[in-house]
């Protein structure tokens, strides 16, 4: 059965300077491969967070993703700025070796609205 990626909120609003959580769950960790968050779509999409050990300022995982059966890949963005506004996608990849990972499923997206303080 194909993995499903669920982003339950279609949109969230957050005041500038505050934090927000973007929720994402998957139905399976197989096929093996990373999960990443992007803002935007297509060639211009921006990598926001990857669950592959790198450090991303202002962004943290919400659950303990070191659990071998973890299916929750939600993130918390701290100190939100107006530049953080946009639509965020949680994307499941199948691992590639000696070639790029292959995107196999994306969540429906969560639009982040940043309100002035």
């Amino acid at each position: 059965t194909e993995v499903k990626v669920t982003q339950p909120e279609k949109s969230v609003s957050v005041a500038a300077g505050d934090s927000t959580i973007l929720n994402c769950t998957v139905t399976s960790l197989l096929p093996v491969g990373p999960i990443r968050w992007y803002r935007g779509v297509g060639q211009s999409r921006l990598l926001i967070y990857s669950f592959t050990g790198e450090h991303f300022p202002r962004i943290r995982n919400v659950s303990d993703t070191t659990k071998r059966n973890n299916m929750d890949f939600s993130i918390r963005i701290s100190n939100v700025t107006p530049e953080d506004a946009g639509t965020y996608y949680c994307v499941k990849f199948q691992r590639g070796s000696s070639e790029p990972d292959t995107e196999i499923q994306s969540g429906g997206g969560t639009e982040v609205y940043v309100l002035a303080k």
């Epitope: 960790l29 197989l30 096929p31 093996v32 990373p34 669950f51 592959t52 050990g53 303990d64 993703t65 070191t66 659990k67 071998r68 059966n69 691992r95 070796s97 000696s98």
Partner: antibody, heavy 118, light 107 residues
Framework: DVQLVESGGGVVRPGESLRLSCAAS????????MSWVRQAPGKGLEWLAG????????YYIDSVKGRFTISRDNPKNSLYLQMSSLTAEDTAVYYC???????????WGLGTLVTVSS | ALTQPASVSANPGETVKITCSGG??????YAWYQQKSPGSAPVTVI????KRPSDIPSRFSGSASGSAATLIITGVRVEDEAVYYC???????????FGAGTTLTVL
């Protein structure tokens, strides 16, 4: 620099218990899953147990389930392996290892020798 | 179980390939661990199929496809003599496994 230092090994009799410790430094211990791996004399590597970063989830190879318990104390930057009902087959060098995001290992300790002998 | 050759040998400067089979590409990630003497601390030379830690020389590389992984040492050196263990993590069973090890002799 990442450092993992095991301790607690020694000579014990069959049926006895032993607790191994692994002191971690040079990284944010509470952010990483950890594992124990052993190597019997003249043999290869054998994974024994793993534990999630928060310590709530543990995983074991079938042959040690019920006899070995992995645990951790994040404020003390320490990993433990409680071993009971030891037999001669448990004689080995025991290593602690830090896990990567996908549960392979990137750093290893120097190991501590456990000898089970009557 | 992961299967790898018991031994390989090469002359300095040659390219060495060590294969590891028995995993499932759908569910298994691979790593390679170097042990220079029995009982000494293993060193990770490749993890996540093809990722090389920053302190490992660039002559070490890895790949995976189908049910096999390969460790490649390009321009092997005498100091690369060691036992190389293939390791796998199976996302279906949540279990780590190792191959029996391959002894690399540099002539």
């Amino acid at each position: 620099d990442v450092q993992l230092v095991e301790s607690g090994g020694g000579v014990v009799r069959p049926g006895e218990s032993l607790r191994l410790s692994c002191a971690a430094s040079g990284f944010t211990f509470s952010s990483y899953a950890m594992s124990w791996v052993r190597q019997a004399p003249g043999k290869g590597l054998e994974w024994l147990a793993g534990i999630s970063a928060g310590g709530s989830d543990t995983y074991y190879i079938d042959s040690v389930k019920g006899r070995f318990t992995i645990s951790r104390d994040n404020p003390k930057n320490s990993l433990y392996l409680q071993m009971s009902s030891l037999t001669a087959e448990d004689t080995a060098v025991y290593y602690c290892a830090r896990e990567t995001w996908n549960h392979l290992f990137d750093y290893w300790g120097l190991g501590t020798l456990v000898t089970v002998s009557s | 179980a992961l299967t790898q050759p018991a031994s390989v040998s090469a002359n300095p400067g040659e390219t060495v390939k060590i294969t590891c089979s028995g995993g499932d590409y759908y569910s298994t990630y691979y790593a390679w661990y170097q042990q220079k003497s029995p009982g000494s601390a293993p060193v990770t030379v490749i993890h996540s199929d093809d990722k090389r830690p920053s302190d490992i020389p660039s002559r070490f590389s890895g790949s995976a496809s189908g049910s096999a992984a390969t460790l490649i040492i390009t321009g092997v050196r005498v100091e690369d003599e060691a036992v190389y263990y293939c390791g796998g993590y199976d996302g279906r069973t949540y279990i780590n496994t190792f191959g029996a090890g391959t002894t690399l002799t540099v002539l």
